[in-house]
């Protein structure tokens, strides 16, 4: 098959800061560009960014998390708590440009979502959110 | 429709599974006005880290 | 690593049907689209439709419609297009392309259909 | 639907020469444009997503770029597997649709 895989990594963002929290094999990815998209969990930004030709983001950065040894824990060894999210948009209709992070479709509706969880989660314990997978309902 | 699926980050400590749920739930229909999403079906659960790459895709409700 | 392996060759009659398969292998979970596009003899690339593997959405391109179906089996993780009214002009080799965070990212090794009285 | 005029349809370079392709949309269509690389006999390999990201493997002599509707792919110093046919591929609406393709020739 053509290509070739890369590793995935989940970039936290809230505020204009991001927390990187990177798996193996390391994503040449960055927090300031869309992921490879050889990645199966594209990194998504929970931030408001400015779109550019190249559509990159910009934010300032701060150090990778690093993972517990505790691989049960939800938690990182910085104290950081995941949660999994699942919901429908029963007024939106899915295609297949909500693949795609370079498309407008899937930027605007990132960016909603984003907005709207930097809304519901105002307080101070809320660092952002990643991995952002849209399918259809 | 379109299904949404993503991780949210706290600090440990900060929230549970419930409280993340119960917030959501709270802003669904503000939601609907200000951002014209019509929110339903919402499931939240405890990501273990390190999460796999593939952790959150077999949450298929 | 992924892959994604496509059935064997076909040699097909006009006003037949062909059925190809597009395999993924090298990842475990069944939540991404698979595009489907043509290549005829010494010619360019042509996008036929899209499925989401697992879910019963597709888009078609017009050209196509009402002469192509795409299905899919999310248990053994392969995705299926089937071409009807086979005509000389379908003959081509027919490619499938896997999403992974982007469009088109994998391709399939390709089905060569040849259409033939 | 949307068209992608891509030029020159062929051309004939040496190995180390700088070499660019153009493809040119009918309409706006962002940043959402594909470059596949594909050797006779072969499958399409993607060489560069979202107009200008390099894929994962993919050598840094290639780099996409873009200026209003017009889509530049540019190797830098051409080396001998290199020579193929080169597409775009835009994906800003369906139906999806590909340049007519460039051959790149050995000189």
């Known amino acids: 098959a053509s290509g070739s895989a890369s590793g995935s990594a989940s970039t936290l963002v809230h505020n204009g800061t991001s927390a990187r929290a990177t798996t193996t094999p390391a994503s040449k990815s960055t927090p300031f560009s869309i992921p490879s998209h050889h990645s199966d969990t594209p990194t998504t930004l929970a931030s408001h960014s400015t779109k550019t030709d190249a559509s990159s983001t910009h934010h300032s950065s701060v150090p990778p998390l690093t993972s517990s040894n505790h691989s049960t824990s939800p938690q990182l060894s910085t104290g950081v708590s995941f949660f999994f999210l699942s919901f429908h948009i029963s007024n939106l209709q899915f295609n297949s440009s909500l693949e795609d992070p370079s498309t407008d479709y899937y930027q605007e509706l990132q960016r909603d979502i984003s907005e709207m969880f930097l809304q519901i989660y105002k307080q101070g314990g809320f660092l952002g959110l990643s991995n952002i997978k849209f399918r259809p309902g | 429709s379109v299904v949404v699926q993503l991780t949210l980050a706290f600090r440990e400590g900060t929230i549970n599974v419930h409280d993340v749920e119960t917030q959501f739930n709270q802003y669904k229909t503000e939601a609907a006005s200000r951002y014209n999403l019509t929110i339903s079906d919402v499931s939240v659960s405890d990501v273990p880290f390190p999460f796999s790459a593939q952790s959150h895709h077999h949450h298929h409700h | 690593e992924v892959q994604l392996v496509q059935s064997g060759a076909e040699v097909k009659k006009p006003g037949a049907s062909v059925k190809v398969s597009c395999k993924a292998s090298?990842?475990?979970?069944?939540?991404?689209?698979i595009n489907w596009v043509r290549q005829r003899p010494g010619q360019g690339l042509e996008w036929i439709g899209y499925?989401?593997?697992?879910?019963?959405?597709?888009e078609y391109n017009e050209k196509f419609k009402g002469r192509v179906t795409l299905t899919s089996d999310t248990s053994a993780s392969t995705a299926y297009m089937e071409l009807s009214s086979l005509r000389s002009e379908d003959t081509a080799v027919y490619y499938c392309?896997?999403?992974?965070?982007?469009?088109?990212?994998?391709w399939g090794q390709g089905t060569l259909v040849t259409v033939s009285s | 639907d949307i068209q992608m005029t891509q030029s020159p349809s062929s051309l004939s370079a040496s190995v180390g020469d700088r070499v660019t392709i153009t493809c040119r949309a009918s309409?706006?269509?962002?940043?959402?444009l594909n470059w596949l690389q594909q050797k006779p006999g072969k499958a399409p390999k993607r060489l560069i997503y979202a107009t200008s990201s390099l894929d994962s493997g993919v050598p840094s002599r290639f780099s996409g770029s873009r200026s209003g509707t017009d889509y530049t792919l540019t190797i830098s110093s051409l080396q001998p597997e290199d020579f193929a046919t080169y597409y775009c591929l835009q994906y800003a609406s369906s139906p999806y649709t590909f340049g007519g393709g460039t051959k790149v020739e050995i000189k």
């Open positions: 392309a896997r999403s992974a965070g982007s469009l088109f990212a994998y």
């Open positions: 309409q706006d269509i962002g940043i959402t």
């Open positions: 499925i989401y593997l697992g879910s019963d959405y597709t």
């Open positions: 090298g990842y475990t979970f069944t939540s991404y689209g």
